[in-house]
Amino acid sequence: AGIPEKAFNLTWISTDFKTILEWQPKPTNYTYTVQISDRSRNWKNKCFSTTDTECDLTDEIVKDVTWAYEAKVLSVPRRNSVHGDGDQLVIHGEEPPFTNAPKFLPYRDTNLGQPVIQQFEQDGRKLNVVVKDSLTLVRKNGTFLTLRQVFGKDLGYIITYRKGSSTGKKTNITNTNEFSIDVEEGVSYCFFVQAMIFSRKTNQNSPGSSTVCTEQWKSFLGE
């Protein structure tokens, strides 16, 4: 077998802490093993001898989302005798070719998922819009934390709305999951929401939610 090709285009794909490392190319006559370093700076083997070009590292990174993880993808010949002891991977006494991934700091680098408008509550001329507080894969004392619990008031929502028939839009920013507006009776309103992390310098905003209108909501509830 020829010398295995080193992986390239190593990319972290992470949304709400669900985290996958992807790379290229598809292997021929060799396999990949991913190694990730923990807080103790030990290397741990993941996706051992895989022919995939991705590896789900969520269970490792959620152990401490404030740590900057290092990972590498090793290219291992299929026919060589390989042993891994959890610390290192050796082929005839030599480390196989590998490529380092960029550092990944989950709390800083995970993308925000698409928010969901959970409900509308009308109280006279006030309309309250509630954005669902989605669960993450981050745990504290054995319990999964919500996005709000993880990011606190650093998590905000940009809410864009318009009267159903109008093209004019208004935008508001809130650091809670609820937002109230004054409405006219009998008029439909449409809402679009984006999540954001105020303190972030990069990947600050989520994709936008689906646009939801109060009329659709009423018909959905069977009113």
């Epitope: 404030t66 900057a68 550092k103 700091l105 800083r108 606190g152 008031k153 303190s199």
Partner: antibody, heavy 118, light 107 residues
Framework: QVQLVQSGAEVKKPGSSVKVSCKAS????????ISWVRQAPGQGLEWMGG????????NHAQKFQGRVTITADESTSTAYMELSSLRSEDTAVYYC???????????WGQGTLVTVSS | EIVLTQSPATLSLSPGERATLSCRAS??????LAWYQQKPGQAPRLLIY???NRATGIPARFSGSGSGTDFTLTISSLEPEDFAVYYC?????????FGQGTKVEIK
Amino acid sequence: QVQLVQSGAEVKKPGSSVKVSCKASGGTFSSYAISWVRQAPGQGLEWMGGIIPIFGTANHAQKFQGRVTITADESTSTAYMELSSLRSEDTAVYYCARGGIGADLDYWGQGTLVTVSS
Amino acid sequence: EIVLTQSPATLSLSPGERATLSCRASQSVAKWLAWYQQKPGQAPRLLIYYASNRATGIPARFSGSGSGTDFTLTISSLEPEDFAVYYCQQSDGWPYTFGQGTKVEIK
């Protein structure tokens, strides 16, 4: 406006410990990183460690491992830095500073002078 | 631990002159680098974040550039209040580290 207010100056004997507090107001506390930075007289800035209160896991510079304890009380929005086995070279101004994880330190406390002298 | 090396240690310039301060990292920090100004008896003040973004209220004469391992802080035309010590700091994951500082003094 975010404010970080630190406890007052301390004079300590070599071998003892000091605990400095940093109370945050005017902004979110739990989800931001609080760092502790010190500056010896006439010297540069030295990052000691940091914590994100929601997670409670502190990280420290290697130099201070085993000697520094960084904690946070979410209920009072207060962070603490305790330094043990004090020596004369620990005489410095100790600052707390706030920043998002992997971000700059955008708000700073006023500093706490700790003098270690026999 | 990432080591940040600032140069020069001291920069002697006159008001109105251009100041160029350098910060080099021992390994790549992408763009996770900030610059601070500190005057005697005061806490540091954030000037530049994420390598090139000016913090709130910082005058346009301050600019930052660079990525990876080499970074520059430029003060286009020194004002009397700009004479101070400047520090770079990396935040590409804990432990954060600071450079040793560059003192900008009046010539």
